[in-house]
């Protein structure tokens, strides 16, 4: 009886693992083995595919074959018993195009209200991704174990920190890789779960802001307790893409080591032009807080984001505020060619109760004021880019008295 060729050959490539699967053509014939040959583009001769000779099952692994993953290859298969079937040719394919990204390795570290995620490719020193290994981005799905409500986080790099979690709570997550340059989306990792730690005695500093005063940067933050010392560290933002690189080292700002106030001042020349990340940590001598959330700091925007100047026209029940371009030395206006929003704070001179207005326009009305009352106003500018989220310092306060009643027209 003539042996039939096997059919429906499937090639599965995940990272550097090359698997072939096929269907037997004739289930009734026993003791059949299968063998593959391969052929490279532009070659006439067929070569025996090592790892896929005289196979008794319907699956084989040819990962040991050192192929050029960008070069098209063709496969053929036949069945063998006493005689052999005719060859069945598989459509030619390019391994790189066919390959899927395997599940990444994931390592978790817990803080009280945050989880640090370390992600690395599932296959170390992969041949398939040798030219693309630095281009992987990752996405993850995270959920509280008790609720199962999922949150997706896209476009993260191989070290990512998730903040604003609850202490002593189990969170679960899974991660997959993507190579956006090749339109490839990978397979999810197994689910990893971790319990956040008991709440730390010292919370991390919050609301970190950078502003410019004279030739210095002023870094300010909020903290819950008094009598603390703080340290500030910085990192080149582009290194976030590549935390495995030896250059990924958080560095001290010398003028911000062991400061006893919730601000520190350091010269602008500490940073060359670029984008940096900053973080702050608190200590009381015995205990240390976790690091604050990292803020992005762009020297180009920061250097030129000056406080707005404004004029006030006083009426009996309101102020009209006209915001102009900030002045630099020499009294020339600064041209700021990115969209800004303005935060205007005002208060009655005899009170500490502040009110706030946020406006995109440069002419703003402050309503509901009392006649013949002194009110003070200060303003600052914010960039509208959420990621950079830069703010100028507040302008000096300007105080004006409202007019007597019936002058609101």
């Amino acid at each position: 009886k003539n042996l039939k060729s096997p059919q429906k050959v499937e090639v599965d490539i995940i990272d550097d693992n090359f698997i072939l699967r096929w269907n037997r053509s004739d289930e009734s014939v026993g003791n059949v083995t299968f063998s593959f040959d391969y052929q490279k583009t532009g070659m006439d001769n067929w070569i025996k595919l090592s790892g896929c000779q005289n196979i008794t099952s319907t699956k084989c692994n040819f990962s040991s074959l050192k192929l050029n993953v960008y070069e098209e290859i063709k496969l053929r298969i036949r069945a063998e018993k006493e005689n052999t079937s005719s060859w069945y040719e598989v459509d030619s394919f390019t391994p790189f195009r066919k390959a899927q990204i395997g599940p990444p390795e994931v390592h978790l570290e817990a803080e009280d209200k945050a989880i640090v995620i370390h992600i690395s490719p599932g296959t170390k020193d992969s041949v398939m991704w040798a030219l693309d290994g630095l281009s992987f981005t990752y996405s993850l799905v995270i959920w509280k174990n008790s609720s199962g409500v999922e949150e997706r986080i896209e476009n993260i790099y191989s070290r990512h920190k998730i903040y604003k979690l609850s202490p002593e709570t189990t969170y679960c997550l899974k991660v997959k890789a993507a190579l956006l340059t090749s339109w490839k989306i990978g397979v999810y990792s197994p689910v990893h779960c971790i319990k956040t730690t008991v709440e730390n005695e010292l919370p991390p500093p919050e609301n970190i802001e950078v502003s410019v005063q004279n030739q210095n940067y002023v870094l300010k933050w909020d903290y819950t307790y008094a009598n603390m010392t703080f340290q500030v560290q910085w990192l080149h933002a582009f290194l976030k893409r590549n935390p495995g690189n030896h250059l990924y080292k958080w560095k001290q700002i010398p003028d911000c080591e062991n400061v006893k106030t919730t601000q520190c001042v350091f010269p602008q020349n500490v940073f060359q032009k670029g984008i940096y990340l900053l973080r702050v940590q608190a200590s009381d001598g015995n205990n240390t807080s976790f690091w604050s959330e990292e803020i992005k700091f762009d020297t180009e925007i920061q250097a030129f984001l000056l406080p707005p100047v404004f004029n006030i026209r006083s009426l009996s029940d309101s102020f009209h505020i006209y915001i102009g371009a900030p002045k630099q030395s020499g009294n020339t206006p600064v041209i700021q060619d990115y969209p800004l929003i303005y935060e205007i704070i005002f208060w009655e001179n005899t009170s500490n109760a502040e009110r706030k207005i946020i406006e995109k326009k440069t002419d703003v009305t402050v309503p509901n004021l009392k006649p013949l009352t002194v009110y003070c106003v200060k303003a600052r500018a914010h960039t509208m880019d959420e990621k950079l989220n830069k703010s100028s310092v507040f302008s000096d306060a300007v105080c004006e008295k409202t007019k007597p009643g019936n002058t609101s027209k």
């Epitope: 040798a130 030219l131 693309d132 290994g133 630095l134 080149h236 582009f238 290194l239 590549n242 690189n245 030896h246 250059l247 080292k249 560095k251 001290q252 010398p254």
Partner: antibody
Amino acid sequence: EVQLVQSGAEVKKPGESLRISCKGSGYTFTNYWMAWVRQMPGKGLESMGIIYPSDSDTRYSPSFQGHVTISADKSISTAYLQWSSLKASDTAMYYCARHDVEGYDYWGQGTLVTVSS
Amino acid sequence: DIQMTQSPSSLSASLGDRVTITCRASQNVGNYLNWYQQKPGKAPKLLIYRASNLASGVPSRFSGSGSGTDFTLTISSLQPEDFATYYCQQMEHAPPTFGQGTKVEIK
């Protein structure tokens, strides 16, 4: 002004030990990697290893691992390269260089080590 | 170790010539690739960092390009002070490694 000042030339016999130094000034010493580079007579540059003085993280090139020791004393802003037993093949010019995201941006003047019986 | 291979290993050129030196890495190094110039008896000098950025004080006739595994240093118009040996260096993997050098000589 950033400066890296290396110790002076050395003439040694095979089997002797040696430590050469590189003192950094004009910058925050602990914020930069320090590299050691060998240049044998008439040859190219060879990376020996690097050290991050802040946490003493040290990485050696495979061909120098076990043959030399790189260390640093951050209290005096100085990095060291040492041999426990010199060989004639260690004869070379040795440079230290400050290393950061912009490459090896400042170099020492070099220390010539001659090993001869 | 990542191997860095420069070509050519030496070249002769005349003043005003455009000179191109290539460097190939055995693995992807992203854009973590630097170029140095060394003159006899002197310490090397950084020319280009992270593939295409001109180091401080380096003339604009020097430029760098490339990413991944293939990189190029170009001198647009060779000057007398440019005759030297040029090295590429990757810093994606620690410790950084150098190419074997390209000697640029006067024709």
